[in-house]
């Protein structure tokens, strides 16, 4: 996706008084514009000139789209869902042709009663949303339907939905075993044929923040990783501060390259710094002036 890159600078001042300017970047606003004039070569990494500035592609920013952002916005869905395709056989209702027609009064009445029954069955499942009848057929009434489950996105959403689908299976098995006809009559809202209960298929929302992060990081995919904060995933490079994976460059600036994160060490009026993490300071001799 294309992104508008408004670049403001944040000044970092070292204890010795030198400054490094690092851009603060917003990569969230999509744009569509066209290349103007012969400024294309000014914008690197697939970015293009819009007449005023370079429009950079994720994960790049800067005047010429030459720098790599420290974090990429990934947005997991607010909620995730599962759909279970089930079949149950209702014995307390005799199949009639009107039930084939989803707009008939008979179908609407059956749908209402069946929904009420299933709402009772699944009442203890917080993820339960409802049921949707997909087909009714002879035998007495074979009800093909979907059970819909939904939960808030968390890193453990798959486990939560998997657990909920197991409880659905347990509850539908229990009710279709207990609510059965006696002497050709049913005392419950609906009665069932115990052997007619089947789970055909289960579909769970697929969302992988790691995969989204890697895709958006493109050729830097090996260096961006996902960390969680308050159950929200963040796609970060080691140059993003405040995370477990953050690189500490001490007296330097973290910069992404195609070989990963590296520290660019600063030189002050009194010291120059070296080492992989810019933590080795060497004091300059007093008679030497640094320009």
């Amino acid at each position: 996706p294309l992104a508008t890159i408004p670049v403001s600078t944040t000044s970092l001042t070292s204890s010795e008084g030198s400054t490094i300017s690092t851009p603060s970047v917003d990569i969230s606003t999509p744009v569509t514009t066209s290349i103007v004039g012969d400024q294309c070569s000014r914008c690197k990494n697939g970015g293009f000139w819009d007449g005023l500035k370079c429009q950079c592609l994720t994960p790049y920013y800067g005047e010429s789209c030459e720098e790599v952002v420290n974090s990429i916005d990934i947005a997991p869905p607010e909620t995730v869902s599962a759909q279970m395709e089930l079949t149950v056989t209702v014995t307390s209702v005799k199949f009639t042709d009107e039930l084939k027609n989803h707009s008939s009064q008979e179908f609407r009445e059956f749908n209402k009663t069946f929904t009420e029954q299933m709402n009772i069955v699944y009442s203890g499942i917080p993820e339960y949303v409802g049921v949707n009848i997909t087909n009714l057929r002879l035998g007495s009434v074979v009800v093909e339907h979907d059970v819909l489950l939904r939960t808030k996105y968390t890193p453990e959403y798959k486990t939560a939905l998997d657990n909920a689908t197991e409880v659905v299976k347990q509850k539908i098995t229990k009710v279709t075993t207990e609510q059965i006809m006696t002497n050709d009559n049913c005392s419950a809202l609906m009665c069932f044929n115990t052997t007619g209960t089947q789970v055909q298929n289960i579909t769970v929302t697929q969302y992988d923040p790691v995969e989204e992060c890697r895709q958006k990081a493109e050729e830097y995919e090996d260096y961006f990783l996902v960390e969680y904060r308050d159950q929200k995933p963040y796609c970060i490079s080691p140059c993003e501060s405040g995370f477990n994976a953050s690189k500490n460059c001490n007296h330097g600036k973290c910069q992404m390259s195609q070989n990963g994160a590296r520290c660019l060490c600063v030189t002050t009026e009194t010291h120059w710094y070296s080492g992989e993490d810019c933590n080795q300071g060497t004091q300059k001799s007093h008679h030497h002036h640094h320009h």
Epitope: S92, V93, E98, E106, E109, N185, L189
Partner: nanobody
Amino acid sequence: DVQLVESGGGLVQPGGSLRLSCAASGFPSSRGTMAWFRQAPGKEREGVAFINSDGRTSYAESVKGRFTISRDNALSSLYLQMNSLRAEDTAMYYCAASLLYLMTVNAAAYPYWGQGTQVTVSS
């Protein structure tokens, strides 16, 4: 809109008879299930007698052999002939209907209801 109106209730001596009627308007009388339920003071509503579109009938154990349910599709009416009435038959009697061919005695399965007619069996 379906409307069910009961009539025929009243005060009768033990051993006596009554015939309850239910006039159904807006209900396709040749389809579904029609039923009589009753509710005595302080008790749950219970199913008394049921009749399906094909004439299949069923009765609560307590009324078998004494009560007879029937329906006249031409007149869109439901009837309950009650013989050998007992004090324990005293209750408000309700006509109920469903468009579905039901085999359940559970009141919650019936979406259409009348206002009821009072039957009192007392000497």
